[in-house]
């Protein structure tokens, strides 16, 4: 039994890091393998992660972390019984994938303005709370070409757009994702999408 693709890990910079790897053949990850991880810190202890299958030869493990700070470094040991298959390390702050925003809501009752709001996925005491920026994706269910991205580079989790920038009388969907420039993170997953019917009064034309 050998590791074909070494583990790569990403952290949500809060409580979970996810590591994925591939074996050289079909593997029952949960029964055959264990990933041991330990914070390099005074009086820390090793923890065991039981991996799950992720495709035939792929494995994934969700590492639970007490909290995360920028200096953190973890040792990782992948075991098959008594055999050490791979040894490595992981610095969560260098491999951050933020949590997805939640509670995306479209407020349509604000005088021909659409107000989209969502929740920051981090608590106020987490470093990322004040460092997230967002991308909002809006698309038409009827017209695949009607697809747009709005970059929200301020901290407030909201976006205002004129209803008239979208077509009237049809349904739209929106979703939002986040990233943090400070840690050069990847984008989060998209939030669940929300749907609304776009309608607004056409401006009265004077002749």
């Amino acid at each position: 039994m050998k590791v074909l693709q070494e583990p790569t890990c990403v952290s949500d910079y809060m409580s979970i890091s996810t590591c994925e790897w591939k074996m050289n053949g079909p593997t029952n990850c949960s029964t055959e393998l264990r990933l041991l991880y330990q914070l390099v810190f005074l009086l820390s202890e090793a923890h065991t992660c039981i991996p799950e299958n992720n495709g035939g030869a792929g494995c994934v493990c969700h590492l639970l972390m007490d909290d995360v700070v920028s200096a953190d470094n973890y040792t990782l040991d992948l075991w098959a019984g008594q055999q050490l298959l791979w040894k490595g390390s992981f610095k969560p702050s260098e491999h951050v994938k933020p949590r997805a925003p939640g509670n995306l809501t479209v407020h349509t009752n604000v005088s021909d303005t659409l107000l989209l709001t969502w929740s920051n996925p981090y608590p106020p005491d987490n470093y990322l709370y004040n460092h997230l920026t967002y991308a909002v994706n809006i698309w038409s269910e009827n017209d695949p070409a009607d697809f747009r991205i709005y970059n929200v580079t301020y901290l407030e989790p909201s976006l205002r757009i004129a209803a008239s920038t979208l077509k009237s009388g049809i349904s739209y969907r929106a979703r939002v994702r986040a990233w943090a420039q400070c840690y050069n993170t990847t984008w989060s997953e998209w939030s669940p999408s929300t749907k609304w019917h776009n309608s607004y009064r056409e401006p009265f034309e004077q002749h």
Epitope: F41, L42, L43, S44, E45, D66, D67, V69, S70, A71
Partner: antibody
Amino acid sequence: EVQLLESGGGLVQPGGSLRLSCAASGFTLSSYAMHWVRQAPGKGLEYVSGISPSSASTYYANSVKGRFTISRDNPKNTLFLQMSSLRAEDTAVYYCVRVKSKYRGGMDVWGQGTTVTVSS
Amino acid sequence: EIVLTQSPGTLSLSPGERATLSCRASQSISTAYLAWYQQKPGQAPRLLIYGTSRRATGIPDRFSGSGSGTDFTLTISRLEPEDFAVYYCQLYGASSVTFGQGTKLEIK
């Protein structure tokens, strides 16, 4: 309420032994690294020793290494410090301390302290 | 072993004034590992700041921490009578724990 209560201090002769205890309440001891910190009369704080949540690892200041032993009884929510070959310079108030998160984050819960006097 | 040096040894100020206490490490340390404590006579120390700048539960916002590398600061923006005490900085690091020698903040 989260509390730590030390006991076992007293007067002991140089070269003697003493065992300090710390009873934890209001939280699960097994979830935290725990420590002993001391303060000699009129002096500053000095770190003494620490122990990991399941006793897998321990750490000692150089000044007590080989003479003091830290241990814990998680089911009884109690921390111990066995002190032997005591010296006059070990005279201090000994505090039992919990860290804010599992291993770190500052020491957020302190006991009221127990006084150890080493004198002939 | 990293040594923490606090200055000044004693700081004499009046209520309402701003207090700035310094802690210098003998070598660079992570901001995650620096904490500040307050101790009043006959009492156990109390955690004020951890992770250089994060206030512990229940600590008033007149207390703030800052710094990086080797130089760290505890600032009390407007001194209240109950703030006069001894303050300690602490390194709680990946391989050791040490305290500074303390700064006594006294009423002028």
